[in-house]
Interface confidence: low
Amino acid sequence: EAHKSEIAHRFNDLGEGHFKGLVLITLSQHLQKSPFEEHVKLVNEVTDFAKACVADESAQNCGKAIATLFGDKVCAIPSLRETYGELADCCAKEDPDRVECFLQHKDDNPNLPPFERPEPEALCTAFKENNDRFIGHYLYEVSRRHPYFYAPELLYYAEKYKNALTECCEAADKAACLTPKLDAIKEKALVSSAQQRLKCASLQKFGERAFKAWSVARLSQKFPKAEFAEISTIVTSLTKVTKECCHGDLLECADDRQELAKYMCEHQDSISSKLKECCVKPTLQKAHCILEIQRDELPTELPDLAVDFVEDKEVCKNFAEAKDVFLGTFLYEYSRRHPEYSIGMLLRIAKGYEAKLEKCCAEADPHACYAKVFDELQPLIDEPKKLVQQNCELFDKLGEYGFQNALAVRYTQKAPQVSTPTLVEYARKLGSVGTKCCSLPETERLSCTENYLALILNRLCILHEKTPVSERVTKCCTESLVNRRPCFSALHVDETYVPKPFHADSFTFHADICTLPEKEKQVKKQMALVELVKHKPKASEEQMKTVMGDFAAFLKKCCDADNKEACFTEDGPKLVAKCQATLA
């Protein structure tokens, strides 16, 4: 139904607390450099305006679209041009062009210091002084660093953060109570951010059809007892919610998400028995619980897929008459039977099936042509299985740090033009997938690995689009969303790359490395490793092992020495010469 005042309607639906949080997130995700105080001032102004509209929906400007009201607020900021440069040019445009222009200026990699966690004592003092302001600051700091974070989920994490502080600030040992809780929230929130970023990229770069296919596969795995029509209804609503959040319409997104959760709870009998435990929870927790829900058990007696998709004489007729519905049904039926496959695998299988029908349905004897389609799709299952098996074996053999090093070498060879810090960052992220997934049972390993890789490669693609340096990376990122991972896997040594000249500075170390925390020490060593591969991209595994062994021995010797700096000064050049000889 149409509302006289959209902003009043959303304020009423969401309540003041969530409304203010979402306004703060909206502003922080668009104006990532502005200080917290400036945002607080704007949030209060927007909230007062919304309250006035609740009192009188016909009041001046209350009938405007929320995006327009936000745009007007942003464009009224006096320091906009000096702080944000060309973002201010958006203000010369009319909506909806102005909204699109703001979106294009969101920075996925803002130049902000890492979000450091203060000491527990300081945290608790600040929290007790003013907990609303404290939680507001958390929303602001996360939002400006993650401009596509799923806003209603961020409200959920803020609530978890608040609960952890409420409990632990009363504990005798605050640190022991807080650290594990905050670490867990941080880890989950980072994954949530990456998942939403992939959804937004899927919609923005590959269109609604790609996102809907992704959603059909995911929901069919989670709710295998639901009918295809039910899955389709949920997918349609979910697409609307996701588009709104990705587009920056966070009040609409959060409100519609609440509606979707309500719908699913009202229809839980025809969706999943697992919804019961979610549907008794309050709003934020309910939607989060549904998002994270365990998959339902498979229905018994599911017929063989071949019955409807190979043996049925009407396959080509069904395909021709309602292509998307027929393929959607195929994806649904395949996905609900295979909870152990990754989304990417399921979508590649559906794509392979579609390609086969495109070809066969144009032939004289279509059935003879597609009769063996499931056998022909088998390599799409074998390839990732084999790859996961090999990489987990390597991970088990080398451990996380050694596995990261192997990946650093592998990815530097694939895309040596990418900057050294970026390659190290991705090698480390890819390496941590081993820790997350390789210890899981066989049935979960495959989907865990490929689903995580999709998130990591999406981040790589987004940052690479901002400053493209490698044609091969661009090709893998843009040609097909579902084939990104196989495309990167298929890349090997870039034969067109001209090796980087040797710079002794890249391999010069000082005594300060000895006092660094273990993680930072590893990063420094991995930077040197990447530089080494850029210098000698075709060095053999043996040569690399020798060099890394010499390097580790050198660090150990000098860090154990009484006069560390003297050791580094004296032995450093010898090590460099030795490495050059090994790699010659």
């Epitope: 392979g352 390609a355 298929a490 090997h492 040594v493």
Partner: nanobody
Framework: DVQLVESGGGVVQPGNSLRLSCAAS????????MSWVRQAPGKGLEWVSS????????LYADSVKGRFTISRDNAKTTLYLQMNSLRPEDTATYYC????????SGQGTLVTVSS
């Protein structure tokens, strides 16, 4: 357009050898790993072997390890599969593919091992 043309198949006796070739065009050959897959009569597709873009890394299915050798000539943009000590169970149509992608398979070349 991407094109993969396999050749070199034929009828051989068990224990003998054959060398398959796959001429590739329409894409940057050196940028991609390549694979051989095969399909025995009435069976599904089976992955046989893969090789990296530079040719430095190779991978084999257990059933062919020690008997088959995959190689490539990047100058000629051609992929090879040297098959020694052939067995009746190696009878199949052999296809070369780009990476693990099915949509880029050639027409295949038939290998029959029989006495």
């Amino acid at each position: 357009d991407v094109q993969l043309v396999e050749s070199g198949g034929g009828v051989v006796q068990p224990g003998n050898s054959l060398r398959l070739s796959c001429a590739a065009s329409g894409f940057t050959f050196t940028s991609f790993g390549m694979s051989w897959v095969r399909q025995a009569p009435g069976k599904g597709l089976e992955w046989v072997s893969s090789i990296s873009g530079s040719g430095s890394d190779t991978l084999y299915a257990d059933s062919v390890k020690g008997r088959f050798t995959i190689s490539r000539d990047n100058a000629k943009t051609t992929l090879y599969l040297q098959m020694n000590s052939l067995r009746p169970e190696d009878t199949a149509t052999y296809y070369c593919t780009i990476g693990g992608s099915l949509s880029r398979s050639g027409q295949g070349t038939l290998v029959t091992v029989s006495s």
